[in-house]
């Protein structure tokens, strides 16, 4: 009947597999085990996907690739020591006396267990890329790392183009042989070697396993270099920028590294594979048994079919690669896995106007001259929405979008942010907080949940902070409930009276103009321009100040702009900012200076949006290298990324106010980038578009 075809990646492994197959057959274990010879783990994964083999044990990185690219699932996991179970932890260790944190690793000297090894390379490098601390251009991870650290010892990097930097701290053996070898010849190789590199002062940080420091300090039976070392002289770097004692690895680590696991096709019964292997380990995992599942000594190798340190195999309940790997490791792998051969040679940028085409063309030429990768190509579209369509259809790759467009791009077209813009603090017109301002009044204090029946002041109909966000937020929270999509009537019935200046007052509820005052002569009441004294953010605040309204929906800067002598107009000249407060979504009130913590939403910065299958790290890597050359508006390199004045336009490709492009970090979805409050407000409004 049924058989399970195990994939072996080498002759010794094939030999051990044959012995295991024979041992299982003699013990009457069913189904029968056959062995298929592959050339590598990658090749085996392809054979399994092609139904020419059924199972193989893989490490975390390979499980990620097999799951993501080929739909394989992990069904049986290895367990090593009882304390940590089916995983161990990758940590970054520093000397207690140093001031290094996870945020200041740039320029420090680094010690790694070896090139492409899990805790010494894959996890730390992947984590640094994924968190936005390390930018990688054109998938050249080695170059990025060699530029990032101030010299390293990465055993095995001697064959690479960046050995000068990556092997700078390596020392070889006592006679200077084997420098940077991925073998014990290099004294700084492996877990203990990388820690020794730190302990002897060659490096400032070592990327090792959670147990490494404790195994190599405090006078254990150690080689001479470690005998005087005390564990208390070292600390771990935590992801949040803090540091912790070396015993705190469960809370303070770069990632939990999953154990190796047996993977199969999605249509294979995982229970069957476990039952087969469980029978096997019951009979063949202890000392005197005729076949040793978890030993490779007889074949002159290590870790054949299973890791030699495996104490038992366990079934995996949630048979998805994501669940097995865990989010920390998964994120690190996302940052690391970048295949230069799969990297498209071009990044096609969406442009919307003739000036933007011109600027994009100049950007493409400037980037090419500096050998930045991938190269830019410029593709025209009619509108932001047309860009989104073309990106989704894979005719274009990237476009910079504003908040509302990011929402549409994410929700309707499935696009994701790859990089964002950051503006100087003075530039509050580009990214700002929407706040609800009230008078400080202890006797009649009310909260955001008690706005019904109050008088409201709005900058104008359709203004982001004056209308869209506050009304959307109140709809989303269930306070305002429009009937038949009639938002205007619902708002007019929710508030006792309002001033919401408007340009087209046809069918406009009268209560939305009830608080408006018009110009000095009382004319132009409720018009959507500055003739209405309560128009705009300044006007909405004035409406509150002059006691026409109880709450004003404005920008976070509005109160400061019109108090403390900042506005000399008679109505504002004597106002003090401390006489006003903000209404917070949690029902509290706060000082006006607390706008970052107490707001209805933040109008987000613009972001570069791409398809979800685009490698966002290569997009940010390109932009980050480019801004080093072209980001300063006064650079002498022949192109200005964040300036459009040469093209008789403004905000071309990027907003001119951009100070720098930033990584998205954890904000990898449109909702993450926009923030839940802003999304909620937009959803509140869009739920009414009938």
């Amino acid at each position: 009947g049924m058989e399970v075809r195990w994939c072996a990646t080498s002759d010794p492994e094939q030999h051990k597999c044959g012995n295991m197959s024979e041992a299982f057959r003699e013990a009457g274990i069913q189904p029968s085990l056959l062995c298929v010879r592959g050339t590598s783990a990658d090749h085996c994964v392809q054979l399994i996907a092609a139904q020419e083999a059924d199972a193989i044990t893989l490490d975390g990185g390979a499980i990620y690739e097999a799951g993501k690219e080929h739909g394989l699932k992990p069904v049986v996991g290895e367990v090593y020591d009882q304390e940590v179970g089916t995983s161990y932890y990758a940590v970054a260790v520093v000397r207690r006396s140093s001031h290094v944190t996870i945020d200041t690793l740039k320029g420090v000297k680094s010690c790694h267990t070896g090139i492409n090894r899990t805790v010494g390379w894959n996890v730390p490098v992947g984590y640094l890329v994924e968190s936005g601390r390390l930018s990688v251009m054109g998938c050249d991870v080695l170059k990025a790392v060699s530029d990032y650290f101030g010299g390293s010892c990465v055993p095995g990097a001697g064959e690479t183009s960046y050995s000068e930097s990556l092997c700078r701290l390596c020392r070889g053996d006592s006679s200077g042989e084997g420098v940077c070898d991925k073998s014990p010849l290099e004294r700084y190789y492996d877990y203990s070697g990388a820690f020794r590199c730190l302990a002897e002062g060659a490096g400032d940080v070592a990327f090792v396993k959670h147990s490494t420091v404790l195994e190599n300090t405090d006078g254990k039976t150690l080689p001479s270099w470690g005998q005087a070392l005390l564990s208390q002289d070292f600390e771990l770097l935590c992801r949040d920028g803090s540091r912790a004692d070396v015993t705190e690895w469960r809370q303070c680590h770069l990632a939990r590294v999953p154990a190796h696991a047996v993977v199969v096709r999605a249509d294979t019964d995982g229970g069957l594979i476990f039952r087969l292997l469980n029978e096997g380990q019951r009979l063949f995992s202890h000392e005197g048994s005729s076949f040793q599942m978890f030993s490779s000594e007889a074949y002159g190798q290590k870790d054949l079919l299973f890791k030699d340190s495996t104490s038992e195999l366990v079934p995996i309940a949630t048979q998805t690669y994501e669940a097995w790997l865990g989010h920390e490791y998964l994120h690190a792998m996302k940052g690391l896995l970048c295949d230069p051969n799969r990297l498209p040679p071009y990044l096609r940028w969406c442009v919307l106007s003739t000036p933007e085409i011109q600027k994009c063309g100049d950007m493409a030429v400037a980037f090419r001259r500096q050998r930045l990768k991938p190269e830019i190509q410029c593709v025209s579209a009619k509108s932001p929405q047309h860009c989104m369509e073309r990106i989704q259809a894979e005719q274009v790759d990237a476009v910079t979008l504003s908040g509302e467009d990011i929402y549409t791009a994410g929700k309707t077209y499935g696009l994701v942010p790859a990089a964002g813009e950051h503006y100087a603090p003075e530039d509050s017109s580009n990214s700002y907080y929407v706040v609800a301002v009230v008078r400080r009044d202890s006797s009649h204090a009310f909260t955001l949940d008690e706005l019904r029946g109050k008088r409201s002041c709005h900058a104008g109909f359709g203004s982001p902070a004056g209308w869209d966000v506050p009304v959307g937020a109140l709809i989303q929270r269930g306070f305002i409930r429009p009937k038949d999509c009639d938002v205007l009537t619902a708002v007019s019935e929710f508030f006792n009276a309002s001033c919401v200046p408007v340009n087209n007052p046809k069918n406009y509820p009268s209560s939305l103009c009830a608080l408006c005052v018009g110009d000095e002569q009382g004319r132009n009441k409720c018009v959507g321009n500055s003739q209405e004294r309560y128009y705009g953010y300044r006007g909405a605040f004035r409406c509150l100040v002059e006691n026409a309204g109880d709450v004003a929906f404005v920008r976070h800067t509005t109160v400061f702009d019109n108090t403390n002598g900042h506005n000399s107009e008679p109505w504002a000249a004597e106002l003090r900012s401390e006489d006003y407060e903000l209404l917070c979504p949690n029902g509290a009130r706060a000082e006006v200076s607390q706008f970052a913590a107490c707001n209805l939403a933040q109008i987000p910065p613009h972001a570069v949006m791409v398809r979800p299958d685009t490698n966002i790290f290569t997009v940010y890597g390109l932009l980050d290298k480019a801004q080093d050359l072209f980001g300063d508006d006064h650079n002498k390199n022949g192109f200005k990324m964040f300036d459009s004045s040469n093209y008789h336009g403004q905000d071309l490709l990027f907003k001119d106010a951009t100070v720098r492009a930033v990584p998205v970090g954890e904000k990898t979805t449109y909702r993450g980038w926009l923030g839940l409050d802003y999304v909620a407000a937009l959803e509140g409004m869009s739920s009414q578009q009938c």
Partner: antibody
Framework: QVQLQESGPGLVKPSETLSLTCTVS????????WNWIRQPPGKGLEYIGY???????YYNPSLKSRVTISRDTSKNQYSLKLSSVTAADTAVYYC?????????????WGQGTLVTVSS | DFVMTQSPLSLPVTLGQPASISCRAS???????????LAWYQQRPGQSPRLLIY???NRFSGVPDRFSGSGSGTDFTLKISRVEAEDVGVYYC?????????FGQGTKLEIK
Amino acid sequence: QVQLQESGPGLVKPSETLSLTCTVSGDSITSGYWNWIRQPPGKGLEYIGYISDSGITYYNPSLKSRVTISRDTSKNQYSLKLSSVTAADTAVYYCARRTLATYYAMDYWGQGTLVTVSS
Amino acid sequence: DFVMTQSPLSLPVTLGQPASISCRASQSLVASDGNTYLAWYQQRPGQSPRLLIYRVSNRFSGVPDRFSGSGSGTDFTLKISRVEAEDVGVYYCSQSTAVPPTFGQGTKLEIK
């Protein structure tokens, strides 16, 4: 009352990394913008960079390749690292705060710490 | 970068007399939000700089009203109506409309 206090070694060798920390009391570094400025002996002020309330950094392009500003919110501190220093980096280094209340002028400064680069 | 040029670089003043320092920017300091991000700082001998004036003309809390700021666009002035002994030091203008923020070279006020 907002107070800022710089700390770090007063002497750094050429080609090494200058490391300073600014400890803030009376305000949280998770709001506002937190800056470093330096002043060579007998000269004017030069802006180095900031770290924002959300942890985003901006560096003066003239120093960008050598500067790292980071923060430790648990200790209400932020730090400056300047790599590959030369004698030209000898200066008094100040930390300072910028907030919206004063339109992002630097309203509170540390007392400054003199860093000499010399072998 | 925006260049800030102060004049005079040295200003000897008699106690009780007015003093005026000029600051010129290489480009207009009016930002897109309409604000002008121009500040003045005082640095007494041996001390760290201290904010006097922000947004061209707003006095920071605790600053005596003998200090006043004015100007627009590219030309700005700091005035001291009656100089006192404690006003001795170097005065810097600074812009933050554009990044990086830049400072003038400083004007040294001394008592005649």
